[in-house]
Amino acid sequence: MMTGTIETTGNISAEKGGSIILQCHLSSTTAQVTQVNWEQQDQLLAICNADLGWHISPSFKDRVAPGPGLGLTLQSLTVNDTGEYFCIYHTYPDGTYTGRIFLEVLESSVAEHGARFQIP
């Protein structure tokens, strides 16, 4: 039985040109994490394999950095980065757990009037 739960950073608003950290945390299970995939829509951004380490998709190499931990750092944000991101935890023996984070990237003109924009 899958008893685990995934906690995420929560949805994020960020400013164009900035950077943000996407993080998920798997809790309430003793299952072994074998691999974590980071995806946006149907695009694979990065893989963190327990044995082989990190692999960043070539098309994202310039703007995606591994970590911290099993998280992912997105840099030089563009409006086109707005969307839903998935952390997919492959575990043994439980199977797959998925977390979801929505990112909204805003023009800096909006940032002057908008939420507390998040640039670490």
């Epitope: 995420t8 929560g10 707005t82 507390r116």
Partner: antibody, heavy 119, light 112 residues
Framework: EVQLQQSGPELVKPGASMKISCKAS????????MNWVKQSHGKNLEWIGL????????SYNQKFKGKATLTVDKSSSTASMEFLSLTSEDSAVYYC????????????WGQGTSVTVSS | DVVLTQTPLSLPVSLGDQVSISCRSS???????????LSWYLHKPGQSPQLLIY???NRFSGVPDRFSGSGSGTDFTLKISTVKPEDLGMYYC?????????FGGGTKLEIK
């Protein structure tokens, strides 16, 4: 003035599908997320999902994944929602609602589209 | 999914009363950057829902200052300082911090 004009009421048979439209005016359509909300029994509100007109990206409430499909037509500033394999549980009022940038809230709402599923 | 519990379900009032509506979340609505995406809506019969408060405490354009929002983490409150006839209807809280977005069950503000 921001306006979201939804298509008219629908009476559909069980098993059929239907498509509701939401025409936006008074603002730059591609710059704002569009949400869809279901209201059943005159009370409960449920978030169905959203679409990003700028890049066509979507996010669905898993409950409605495979049931609802969200699309946009940028040329006419129109968002649409198709509902598949309708059952009596899908009888409700459906709203489109513009996202408030930076705050994950909904600032302007359409007038609602009433959908009745009945044989 | 995050569950939002609103209390009371029904709130009988007299015009001029001060009232409070509570919205409690099953988990914290503050993201890892310190932002909290909690908003309040009024749904009047025969109309569409209307945004009152966003980001816990920001009044939306045109919303009278008798409406105020407060709270943090998992506990949030909407206050109406002096109830007017046009305030009657269903009030809902909405969280947009976690996917999927979820609404509270609603609070009906009605005349005693």
């Amino acid at each position: 003035e921001v306006q979201l004009q939804q298509s008219g009421p629908e009476l559909v048979k069980p098993g059929a599908s239907m498509k509701i439209s939401c025409k936006a005016s008074g603002y730059s359509f591609i710059d704002y997320i569009m949400n869809w909300v279901k209201q059943s029994h005159g009370k409960n509100l449920e978030w169905i999902g959203l679409i990003i007109p700028y890049n066509g990206g979507t996010s669905y409430n898993q409950k409605f994944k495979g049931k609802a499909t969200l699309t946009v037509d940028k040329s006419s500033s129109t968002a649409s929602m198709e509902f598949l394999s309708l059952t009596s549980e899908d009888s409700a009022v459906y709203y489109c609602a513009r996202g408030l940038r930076g705050y994950y809230a909904m600032d302007y709402w359409g007038q609602g589209t009433s959908v009745t599923v009945s044989s | 999914d995050v569950v939002l519990t609103q209390t009371p379900l029904s709130l009988p009032v007299s015009l001029g009363d001060q009232v409070s509506i509570s919205c409690r979340s099953s988990q914290s609505l503050t993201n890892s950057y310190g932002s909290t995406f909690l908003s309040w809506y009024l749904h009047k019969p025969g109309q569409s829902p209307q945004l009152l408060i966003y980001g816990i405490s920001n009044r939306f354009s045109g919303v009278p200052d008798r409406f105020s929002g407060s709270g943090s983490g998992t506990d949030f409150t909407l206050k109406i300082s002096t109830v007017k006839p046009e305030d009657l209807g269903m009030y809902y809280c909405l969280q947009g911090t976690h996917q999927p977005w979820t609404f509270g069950g609603g609070t009906k503000l009605e005349i005693k």
